[in-house]
Amino acid sequence: LEVQVPEDPVVALVGTDATLCCSFSPEPGFSLAQLNLIWQLTDTKQLVHSFAEGQDQGSAYANRTALFPDLLAQGNASLRLQRVRVADEGSFTCFVSIRDFGSAAVSLQVAAPYSKPSMTLEPNKDLRPGDTVTITCSSYQGYPEAEVFWQDGQGVPLTGNVTTSQMANEQGLFDVHSILRVVLGANGTYSCLVRNPVLQQDAHSSVTITPQRSPTGAVEVQVPEDPVVALVGTDATLRCSFSPEPGFSLAQLNLIWQLTDTKQLVHSFTEGRDQGSAYANRTALFPDLLAQGNASLRLQRVRVADEGSFTCFVSIRDFGSAAVSLQVAAPYSKPSMTLEPNKDLRPGDTVTITCSSYRGYPEAEVFWQDGQGVPLTGNVTTSQMANEQGLFDVHSVLRVVLGANGTYSCLVRNPVLQQDAHGSVTITGQPMTFPPEA
């Protein structure tokens, strides 16, 4: 009896479901009562699942396996393995007995994508050319072990003085830490690339060091190239799409949205069903559009903490993923202006003008200018403080010596929204009180 399995390993993402394909050619008049089907681990011979005496005997493998009962009669002896774990990796043998006997082994290769690497420097301040610096590149929760590559700004590989360690957690997923020791030149860019050899997925980050200053990063899945900008408190749509084939069925679809860096699950659609939000119940898919290839995610009541990269994983017959960035923004309020002192002002007095604008995001750019539009850059101190929601209050202080009269304007710019909020104060030359009395 000829039993057919794929030659290549079946690659499955941790936490998703995998199908170990196995088929045989039923003869005319074949009946399930004739079938003995056994799935077992090739090496240990541990029973995984079986079908005998015309009945599915069920899973012997942590209740995470299932056959395709409606397809058995057509010769489809495939095994569905749910919620794949690293420990599942290995060879599974499919034994089929009807009149004759046949078997074949299929390999399961488990994989998990690595997060975008984070980069740290030691020391990270007062750097000068000639200093030796240690750059650490860390990427998390991937499998199997990663390949790590370093290169400079010109793409030249850096192989000397690299130490890489990989540690598996309880789930068998690896955290990789790679350390590069370099002697700084006048300036330099250092890139770390963490490659998942199974997924052929590259995660990379780079750091540019300018000494004497603190360093300051198979299914075609389509997402917007530009970040999605969303106002705090509004709803955002993270667009993701794929091209369904004729006859595409939602039962074939595995869709996973997760945070790119931490791999935290955000939302999923598997086994023909919306599995719901795993992200504070603030996410939703567009169920009526999934069959047309629209895998977009709706994120409700956006918060500052939502900012970052979200990855859309789509698995049908093949697998594909793409990441979309969410840029959160909040407009700054119209600045309020205060003077200190604010009465009996005379030409020649030094006055402190404070410009305050509230509850914006991200951090603002603040500009001062006089009545003629000439920038005022000296004696300006600006502070920005985030509240519990991550929104910034900005306070900018200008110290000036009063002339005969003068107008002082403060402009608070939100760099993402390209929104300018401005306030101004006019101080006349004669003795005066601020605000002017009616």
Partner: antibody
Framework: DVQLQVSGPGLVKPSQSLSLTCSVA?????????WNWIRQFPGNKLEWMGY???????NYNPSLKNRISITRDTSKGQFFLKFNSVTTEDTATYYC????????????WGQGTTLTVSS | QAVVTQESALTTSPGGTVILTCRSS?????????ANWVQEKPDHLFTGLIG???NRAPGVPVRFSGSLIGDKAALTITGAQTEDDAMYFC?????????FGGGTMVTVL
């Protein structure tokens, strides 16, 4: 052998709703395959209208999406094409056909039923 | 919506070879268009021949084959027989739906 048979009213008035039935014998519509509606206008032009797959997933021709729905009765082995409002331009011969998932051919066709929309 | 174009009519002799093509208004036809070929004989008898560019439906004679030729999908009838005298429609998949061509009348005489 698999057989598909289309049935419908034959003559309807404009703006009326309409339901056509495709009865499948010899195969379970929940086992596999995707089940299509296709129509042929006078003059021979064919138009693919949509399908319902074995698990109930629908896909429709965008030009018809808001006017039709495809549903099924699994216990009777039937699937249906429903129009919410017909026009004279819906006069055509309507066919159902089985599509093979992964190979994408239409391997079995119903014999078709002629629908005339006229006041 | 995309427009799919076929030759209106082709003629061949018994035993001859005829190639029908299917062009897309949106550009080159690729395997992602899952080209489909359907035969219609008198009395509206339809038979599916080819799906997914080149997958022959069960029971379809091997003289029918599907392929991509240049930027078009093609149906080749090699060793045509008189019973192949029929109308042939191609359909191309555009992400969520099929669009049929106008059909090619093949005469075998």
């Amino acid at each position: 052998d698999v057989q598909l048979q289309v049935s419908g009213p034959g003559l309807v008035k404009p703006s009326q709703s309409l339901s056509l039935t495709c009865s499948v014998a010899g195969y379970s519509i929940t086992s596999d395959y995707y089940w299509n509606w296709i129509r042929q206008f006078p003059g021979n032009k064919l138009e693919w209208m949509g399908y319902i797959s074995y698990d109930g997933t629908n896909n429709y021709n965008p030009s018809l999406k808001n006017r039709i729905s495809i549903t099924r009765d699994t216990s009777k082995g039937q699937f249906f094409l429903k129009f919410n409002s017909v026009t004279t331009e819906d006069t055509a011969t309507y066919y159902c056909a089985r599509g093979k998932d992964g190979s994408y051919y239409f391997d079995y066709w119903g014999q078709g039923t002629t629908l005339t929309v006229s006041s | 919506q995309a427009v799919v174009t076929q030759e209106s009519a082709l003629t061949t002799s018994p035993g001859g070879t005829v190639i029908l093509t299917c062009r897309s208004s949106t550009g080159a036809v690729t395997t992602s268009n899952y080209a489909n070929w359907v035969q219609e004989k008198p009395d509206h008898l339809f038979t599916g021949l080819i799906g997914g560019t080149s997958n022959r439906a069960p029971g379809v004679p091997v003289r029918f084959s599907g392929s991509l030729i240049g930027d078009k999908a093609a149906l080749t009838i090699t060793g045509a027989q008189t019973e192949d005298d029929a109308m042939y429609f191609c359909a191309l998949w555009y992400r969520t739906h099929y669009v049929f061509g106008g059909g090619t009348m093949v005469t075998v005489l």
